[in-house]
């Protein structure tokens, strides 16, 4: 089902431990994350916020497969967590460290 | 050659003809669009500016690639192009068409 | 405006489970953590847990084996759980909203655990 | 795993400085945070310092925190106290054991 398997946002939960990141993440022990998984077909959907370049690049790759790669579906904005971490043996409190979910994802 | 495969620019020619657009590109008949290609594997290089997401996401992938996909190798920043176009009938002159051409790849 | 009520029972038998749910509104679970916290009768201030904005979960290793905390985004609530309960975990148990700083809390529910 | 050790009660008259101490058991007091907490009787605490210094919008400036290294302590001082200071005064740090650790509370009478 290609609709099925089109760029969207599913769920991904980081295990800090998973990834050695205890070692200076005391808090939480992991989080939901997501991740964008899917294809990038031509035509791209507005809700995927497709730049011209995407959009180009995808119609070429539709065209000639050979000439150029699919655009790909990757977060298009990403939201901060809470988090208490080891900062030069201090532990510290941030409210809001950045760039760490996923909120939307799009083809670029 | 892992680093040759390594996540980068690379030229893309987009002939405005063979997508259709010259029905309403008047000029140029194409342009040099470059596409980013290649493989973001941990650890992510500091050039193609990974979000913290990325990292976790090529970490986990590399601890457990069914777990998580690769992060993706994307234009980070687009630059415009300027067109001659035809709006409603009247030939007109864009002198910045925006994000139209890659001009950095990064891994997202 | 930002509001944390706690709802669940006055009394609990010896050896039952305790439940309570912290409703919020005028912030997402998303964006804020929430702490439980609870005072015995005339004593001190004991953090439980807290449910984290990325919906990881932290608990107090003297609770870990017999609390669960857990959320309904969609609600706005966070619920706590806490099995096996004898006479000393009598206390008021608070949810507070913890952004830059602990900011709000709610009133507290008084639970007396008695047969 | 270490603990905040607070007096149990304080006095002070209206008008005076008082200084309340939070003693960090093991362990370095600087090595994070204290918060401060006030609590009156049968209320929800509210928070009057922050990162050890720092007031929250609305706290009184003559609610002020810091610390001394060398006798391992946290201190919230207030100036030219208030009738409607007297309440149960928790210090709060962390730890990587148990996350959020609490003062067993200091009740400061206001004379």
């Known amino acids: 089902n290609a609709k099925g398997n089109y760029c969207k946002r599913t769920p991904l939960y980081i295990d800090f431990k998973e990834i050695g990141w205890d070692s200076w993440i005391i808090a939480p022990p992991g989080y939901e994350a997501y991740e964008c998984r899917g294809v990038c077909n031509y035509p791209l959907a507005e809700h995927l916020t497709p730049t011209k370049h995407a959009i180009i690049q995808a119609l070429v790759h539709l065209k000639n497969s050979q000439k150029a790669s699919k655009a790909c579906c990757v977060p298009t904005k990403l939201e901060p967590i809470s988090i208490l971490y080891l900062d030069k043996g201090v532990v510290t409190y941030k409210f809001k460290y950045e760039g760490m979910a996923v909120s939307e994802c799009g083809c670029r | 050659n892992a680093k040759g495969n390594y996540c980068k620019r690379t030229p893309l020619y987009i002939d405005f003809k063979e997508i259709g657009w010259d029905s309403w590109i008047i000029a140029p008949p194409g342009y040099e669009a470059y596409e980013c290609r290649g493989v973001c594997n941990y650890p992510l290089a500091e050039h193609l500016t990974p979000t913290k997401h990325a990292i976790i996401q090529a970490l986990v992938h590399l601890k457990n690639s069914q777990k998580a996909s690769k992060a993706c190798c994307v234009p980070t920043k687009l630059e415009p192009i300027s067109i001659l176009y035809l709006d409603k009938g009247v030939v007109t002159y864009k002198f910045k068409y925006e994000g139209m051409a890659v001009s950095e790849c990064g891994c997202r | 405006q930002v509001q944390l009520k706690e709802t669940g029972p006055d009394l609990v038998q010896p050896t039952q489970t305790l439940d309570i749910t912290c409703t919020v509104s005028?912030?997402?679970?998303?964006?804020?953590?929430v702490h439980w916290v609870r005072q015995p009768p005339g004593k001190g201030l004991e953090w439980m847990g807290t449910?984290?904005?990325?919906?990881?979960?932290d608990y107090n290793s003297a609770f870990k084996s017999r609390l669960a905390i857990s959320r309904d985004t969609s609600k706005s609530e966070v619920f706590l759980k806490m099995d096996s309960l004898q006479t000393d975990d009598t206390a008021k148990y608070f949810c507070?909203?913890?952004?830059?700083?602990?900011?709000?809390w709610g009133q507290g529910i008084m639970v007396t655990v008695s047969s | 795993q270490f603990a905040l050790i607070q007096s149990d009660s304080m006095s002070t008259s209206a008008g005076s400085t008082v200084k309340l101490s939070c003693k960090r058991s093991?362990?370095?007091?600087?090595?994070?945070?204290v918060y401060w907490y006030q609590q009156h009787e049968g209320r929800s605490p509210t928070t009057m310092i922050y990162?050890?210094?720092?007031?929250p919008d609305g706290v009184p400036d003559r609610f002020s925190g810091s610390i001394d290294s060398s006798s391992n302590s946290a201190f919230l001082t207030i100036n030219d106290v208030q009738i409607e200071d007297e309440a149960v005064y928790f210090c709060?740090?962390?730890?990587?054991?148990?996350?959020?650790?609490f003062g067993g509370g200091t009740k400061l009478t206001v004379l």
């Open positions: 507070a909203r913890l952004g830059y700083y602990v900011d709000y």
């Open positions: 005028g912030f997402s679970l998303t964006t804020y953590n």
């Open positions: 449910m984290w904005n990325g919906g990881g979960i």
């Open positions: 093991t362990g370095n007091i600087g090595s994070s945070y």
């Open positions: 990162d050890g210094d720092k007031r």
């Open positions: 709060q740090s962390f730890s990587s054991g148990i996350k959020f650790i």
